[in-house]
Amino acid sequence: LCQGSNYSTCASCPSCPDRWMKYGNHCYYFSVEEKDWNSSLEFCLARDSHLLVITDNQEMSLLQVFLSEAFCWIGLRNNSGWRWEDGSPLNFSRISSNSFVQTCGAINKNGLQASSCEVPLHWVCKKCPFADQALF
């Protein structure tokens, strides 16, 4: 069911890889180390996943339970407006953004925050489990 689109929702999610957490119909990876935004994206892509794209407030609230004050990179960037890596606009939540040079999105337990993209942060990857092929 996940085949055919890079950004579909997993329907059946039997299992996640080691060190990935199964939540709902997806697998999530919370990094221990820190990287800049681009390196975090590359890490996720190399593991058939993507930097976290949050689909709605419910998913965001659930994920924030696992987060601390420390920020984690997610698949959100400001290219003439805040957009997720799947191309969809950020429309269900506010991002705290202060400066023109802060064009990458991060999340912690308190919400979304813009940051300069080269800041080393933890990151979150998201993917469908083994039985499915899509990234989301």
């Epitope: 400066s99 040079v101 925050q113």
Partner: antibody, heavy 125, light 112 residues
Framework: QVTLKESGPGILQPSQTLSLTCSVS??????????VGWIRQPSGKGLEWLAH???????WYELALKSRLTISKDSSKNQVFLKIANVDTADTATYFC?????????????????WGPGTSVTVSS | DVLMTQTPLSLPVSLGAQASISCKSS???????????LEWYLQKPGQSPKILIY???NRFSGVPDRFSGSGSGTDFTLKISRVEAEDLGVYYC?????????FGAGTKLELK
């Protein structure tokens, strides 16, 4: 809209301590990635970086002046403070505060995207 | 400390003409993370500096496209394609790649 405004004593005597305040609005001093730095400019001369303080209270100083400088902040009042001990006439300058944006290093690489208008300080006996 | 040398110190220009300011660093200011933290600021008479360019060539928000930054390693240039009266003032380059961060001595852009 982001604004910064410096205030100081205007004139003070050699060996006294200079106390400067930077009052900010339009952003929070405790927001991740935000900092405030102090820069000075003697009349008709260039710019000299002095110190900066980050959102989490991490502080950095110009090495040559470090023993005389103290930077601090009160996030609840949106103010950043700089003290310069034992001033002399060489400290006569316009003092600017500027917002600095974090790029991943505490000590260096940042952008100063908003500046205050500056406050003039004269050290004279 | 990284010495930032700006040339010329004074640049007389005619309105509508192109202006070019050079900034050379005493050592490479390419950071170990691959980025080059070279910025340009303009200080108009009686005002505080304003950021124009960050990371060598990125124009800051609201900066007109007649301003462009270029360069790499130790050699950097700010170009103004068609000088307007509001562009007059002192231009400073700034490196943030190495501690302590340092400014150039400034280039005064004035009318010929």
């Amino acid at each position: 809209q982001v604004t910064l405004k410096e205030s100081g004593p205007g004139i003070l005597q050699p060996s006294q301590t200079l106390s400067l305040t930077c009052s900010v609005s339009g952003f929070s001093l405790s927001t991740f990635g935000m900092g405030v730095g102090w820069i000075r400019q003697p009349s008709g001369k260039g710019l000299e970086w002095l110190a900066h303080i980050w959102w989490d209270d991490d502080k950095w100083y110009e090495l040559a002046l470090k023993s005389r400088l103290t930077i601090s902040k009160d996030s609840s009042k949106n103010q950043v403070f700089l003290k310069i001990a034992n001033v002399d006439t060489a400290d006569t300058a316009t003092y600017f505060c500027a917002r600095v944006i974090y790029y991943g290093s505490r000590s260096a690489y940042y952008s100063m995207d908003y500046w205050g208008p500056g406050t003039s300080v004269t050290v004279s006996s | 400390d990284v010495l930032m040398t700006q040339t010329p110190l004074s640049l007389p220009v005619s309105l509508g003409a192109q202006a070019s300011i050079s900034c050379k660093s005493s050592q490479s200011i390419v950071h170990s993370n691959g980025h080059t933290y070279l910025e340009w600021y303009l200080q108009k008479p009686g005002q505080s500096p304003k950021i124009l360019i960050y990371k060598v060539s990125n124009r800051f928000s609201g900066v007109p496209d007649r301003f462009s930054g270029s360069g790499s390693g130790t050699d950097f240039t700010l170009k103004i394609s068609r000088v307007e009266a509001e562009d007059l003032g002192v231009y400073y380059c700034f490196q943030g790649s190495h501690v302590p961060v340092t400014f150039g001595a400034g280039t005064k852009l004035e009318l010929k």
